[in-house]
Amino acid sequence: IWELKKDVYVVELDWYPDAPGEMVVLTCDTPEEDGITWTLDQSSEVLGSGKTLTIQVKEFGDAGQYTCHKGGEVLSHSLLLLHKKEDGIWSTDILKDQKEPKNKTFLRCEAKNYSGRFTCWWLTTISTDLTFSVKSSRGSSDPQGVTCGAATLSAERVRGDNKEYEYSVECQEDSACPAAEESLPIEVMVDAVHKLKYENYTSSFFIRDIIKPDPPKNLQLKPLKNSRQVEVSWEYPDTWSTPHSYFSLTFCVQVQGKSKREKKDRVFTDKTSATVICRKNASISVRAQDRYYSSSWSEWASVPCS
Amino acid sequence: RNLPVATPDPGMFPCLHHSQNLLRAVSNMLQKARQTLEFYPCTSEEIDHEDITKDKTSTVEACLPLELTKNESCLNSRETSFITNGSCLASRKTSFMMALCLSSIYEDLKMYQVEFKTMNAKLLMDPKRQIFLDQNMLAVIDELMQALNFNSETVPQKSSLEEPDFYKTKIKLCILLHAFRIRAVTIDRVMSYLNAS
């Protein structure tokens, strides 16, 4: 058993049929010595008396809020949560496996630049009685500070018969140099509590590996004189690290005909313009990637030819 | 430690082209190592990230763009010097700071060159003949060092009398390649910045 936060405790249980469970001793936080009784949750049934209560925790029915009273007055609470271990593996029932970039990916994180700010998100089908708390650091043995905000519900989607909820959190490394060469990874730890079930999820990464620039901005077409061609131009996204001559991007330019079956024409370029033959109903799209370290491509910025 | 003395050539300093070739060569070599050594811990998640140039050179700090010198987090690790002006032109007006930056890059390359050559000598003795260093990568390191054009004492290749542990050597190769790729990215960024200055 260990303390998650004040008056909230996590009991770690090997979860299999007829498992013996864990013996837990609860102590009432009071100077009083006698006349103390214990109850669980809303029940008025007295579970025991005295300053301590010993219980055998085997299943969710044994978890919950234990309260010690004296003469009708509440003295203190202890909330017991269960953390299940099945076949030596901690349960992952609360969050959905996103399977990207690999199986057992519950947390996904992205950064728009090298400033040390990043966003992580996760998915669940659970809609109520759910809380998350997020901690992060650079390295684990001698951790350096990363500050995370509160996790918030950022999107709801319908997937077949199920509703899916996306939660996200923003974190910022306390002292980040965009030009630094990372040697210690960022660690992100998410504590998830659903009703009386506790689970924890972790992710470890270098900022350089989770970079995904915003799409290029100001994608524009300028017709060229006496020609079917247009000059396509775009700019670095505002959120990208500066100076741009140091933090350079490369771009993918794509021309897509009106029919999705039509083969796309595409090139890579380091420049922020290109000349394109713009056919009716075609569209031009541009996306960006760090020029020197191949992490993710941005989403496409698109403009119609008409 | 004496910094090498710059002996600039007249005309364009072809650093950018060579640094792009360097990044491409080390990325290809790393990819090859990951594939060939698939049953060894060779991915970014599995290896310890070591920097053989730590406390010997200060490339990130010496080559910090002017715009980042206002960021205190970029200044707290060492006595820092910045690129204050100049481009990747080997003119006689090359600033002292830029010379410091380029000499630091040169020292990095020299250190990695020695390590890679020593390692290759060991790998050539491996009866499995599983992996060797790409000669193209070694040649590209050499070309960039020549383009940087610094005079520096030659570092003798390390020789070892004991029987090499090939497993350890291959893991060390992965560690070195990951670190060198990260440094090659920094070098490429620096050259691009200098070229645009």
Epitope: T250, D265, R266, F268, K271, T275, I277 | Q20
Partner: nanobody
């Protein structure tokens, strides 16, 4: 294996025009980016113009924009460079090149794996 052969070079007065052609054989080139590069005596080879596989996207070095036009005819496996308002500084050997679109930025020399022998362009005043 792709073979590339350039033609159309020659000598011309300042302000004159030339049309260079590059014919590919050995493989259909419609999946390849193609480009023109030039090398003047004693200078590095430099990018002139490039065009995408289907011919819809192109780019030029700043000094030739508005004077040169790159195009291609995939049915004939041929790429062209129409050069107008020629200047003495355009004097060079012009090489055509072909490379997979995914090999890298199409304005960069190293993104091209196949190269022609070159055709000489001389602009005299």
């Amino acid at each position: 294996q792709v073979q590339l052969v350039e033609s159309g070079g020659g000598s011309v007065q300042v302000g004159g025009s030339l049309r260079l052609s590059c014919v590919g054989s050995g493989r259909t080139l419609n999946m390849y980016n193609m480009g023109w590069f030039r090398q003047a005596p004693g200078k590095e080879r430099e990018f002139v113009a490039a065009i995408s596989g289907k011919g819809l996207i192109s780019d030029y070095r700043d000094s030739v924009k508005g004077r040169f036009t790159i195009s291609r005819d995939n049915a004939r496996n041929t790429m062209y460079l129409q050069m107008n308002s020629l200047k003495p500084e355009d004097t060079a050997v012009y090489h055509c090149a072909a490379g997979q679109w995914s090999a890298g930025p199409f304005t960069r020399e190293r993104s091209y794996e196949y190269w022609g022998q070159g055709t000489q362009v001389t602009v005299s005043s």
